[in-house]
């Protein structure tokens, strides 16, 4: 999916008002210095591509993020403010219902959510030069 035509300001507002808090809740009890940010993004569409991938694609050691509150809210924001995104999710949603992985917070998941926090922060500061 190409995120170029999303309403970035409305997605940013949703992140600031609610998604960010859910990410913090998920990470509660974890030191902010515990994980190094290894995933980066260069512009807003690229950031959303990486955010979608890390949030919804199961990875080795972390198969369960899609059911978390921050993930549900991310999906809603993309469906509402990214033209045509919802139709790409019809089959994906049905597949996810079949999988229905249990919600388990592993260290790998915590690391992944830490990466997500970094991607979202980068999404909110699109004019900063890449380090």
């Amino acid at each position: 999916y190409d995120f170029t035509n999303c309403d970035f300001e409305k997605i940013k507002a949703a992140y600031l008002s609610t998604i960010s808090k859910d990410l913090i809740t998920y990470m509660s009890g974890t030191k902010s210095t515990e994980f190094n940010n290894t995933v980066s993004c260069s512009n807003r569409p690229h950031c959303l591509t990486e955010i979608q991938s890390l949030t919804f694609n199961p990875t080795a050691g972390c198969a369960s993020l899609a059911k978390e509150m921050f993930a549900m809210k991310t999906k809603a924001a993309l469906a509402i403010w990214c033209p045509g995104y919802s139709e790409t999710q019809i089959n994906a949603t049905q597949a996810m219902k079949k999988r229905r992985a249990a919600k388990v917070t592993t260290n790998k998941c915590l690391e992944q959510v830490s990466q997500l926090q970094g991607l979202w922060r980068r999404f909110n500061r699109p004019l900063l030069k890449q380090q």
């Epitope: 045509g84 919802s86 999710q89």
Partner: antibody, heavy 120, light 107 residues
Framework: QVQLVQSGAEVKKPGASVKVSCKAS????????MHWVRQAPGQGLEWMGT????????DYNQNFKGRVTMTTDTSTSTAYMELRSLRSDDTAVYYC?????????????WGQGTLVTVSS | EIVLTQSPGTLSLSPGERATLSCRAS??????VHWYQQKPGQAPRLLIY???QSISGIPDRFSGSGSGTDFTLTISRLEPEDFAVYYC?????????FGQGTKVEIK
């Protein structure tokens, strides 16, 4: 089963405000956005806007910007649509309709409609 | 804003005949089109979603097709209860919009 029950018909004077309610039952309220659509007598359907409880935010059709406010009360699973500075051409049936925001993504259930008549 | 244009405005047919309703979008919207039926004094009822997906409880004489800018709702054999107004809607991008409707009336 899924039900959306709207408040009763209203008669208002030009310049007044109206607040229509839509009580939902039979599903998880926060899994769906609530959309509002109106239909003037003998006319087609016009999308007014939506409130997304999951994100606690709204998005409105520019045609109504500044005149409409959509809210929800998640404790009672009720959505509200307030339209201000009413004009005679706001006379219409106002519908609420739910739409999944993390699945389905379509207006699959509608309220029965609320007739709002604006007349001096 | 995406404009949906439905044609014809009115379709006069007899029970048992086939009805073909068209909906054209002002720009490509992939398959983000849904079809509703509305009878006098009633709320719209969803018939088809995402261009061709069927809804449980809707008779299989209703079918949809199309993608991009051109979409079609087909009623294979009109039953007396099918005479109504039909609307297409796009949810590709905000603001969501509806076509002006096609009235299917008894000839």
């Amino acid at each position: 089963q899924v039900q959306l029950v709207q408040s009763g018909a209203e008669v208002k004077k030009p310049g007044a405000s109206v607040k229509v309610s839509c009580k939902a039952s039979g599903y998880i309220f926060t899994d769906y956005a609530m959309h509002w659509v109106r239909q003037a007598p003998g006319q087609g359907l016009e999308w007014m806007g939506t409130f997304i409880p999951l994100l606690d935010t709204s998005d409105y059709n520019q045609n109504f910007k500044g005149r409409v406010t959509m809210t929800t009360d998640t404790s009672t699973s009720t959505a509200y649509m307030e339209l201000r500075s009413l004009r005679s051409d706001d006379t219409a049936v106002y519908y609420c309709a739910r739409m999944g925001v993390t699945h389905s993504y379509v207006m699959d259930a509608w309220g029965q409609g609320t007739l709002v008549t604006v007349s001096s | 804003e995406i404009v949906l244009t439905q044609s014809p405005g009115t379709l006069s047919l007899s029970p048992g005949e086939r009805a073909t309703l068209s909906c054209r979008a002002s720009q490509p919207i992939s398959i983000s089109v849904h079809w509703y039926q509305q009878k006098p004094g009633q709320a719209p009822r969803l018939l088809i979603y995402f261009a061709s997906q069927s809804i449980s409880g809707i008779p299989d004489r209703f079918s949809g097709s199309g993608s991009g800018t051109d979409f079609t709702l087909t009623i294979s054999r009109l039953e007396p209860e099918d005479f109504a107004v039909y609307y297409c809607q796009q949810t590709f991008s905000l603001p969501y919009t509806f076509g002006q409707g096609t009235k299917v009336e008894i000839k």
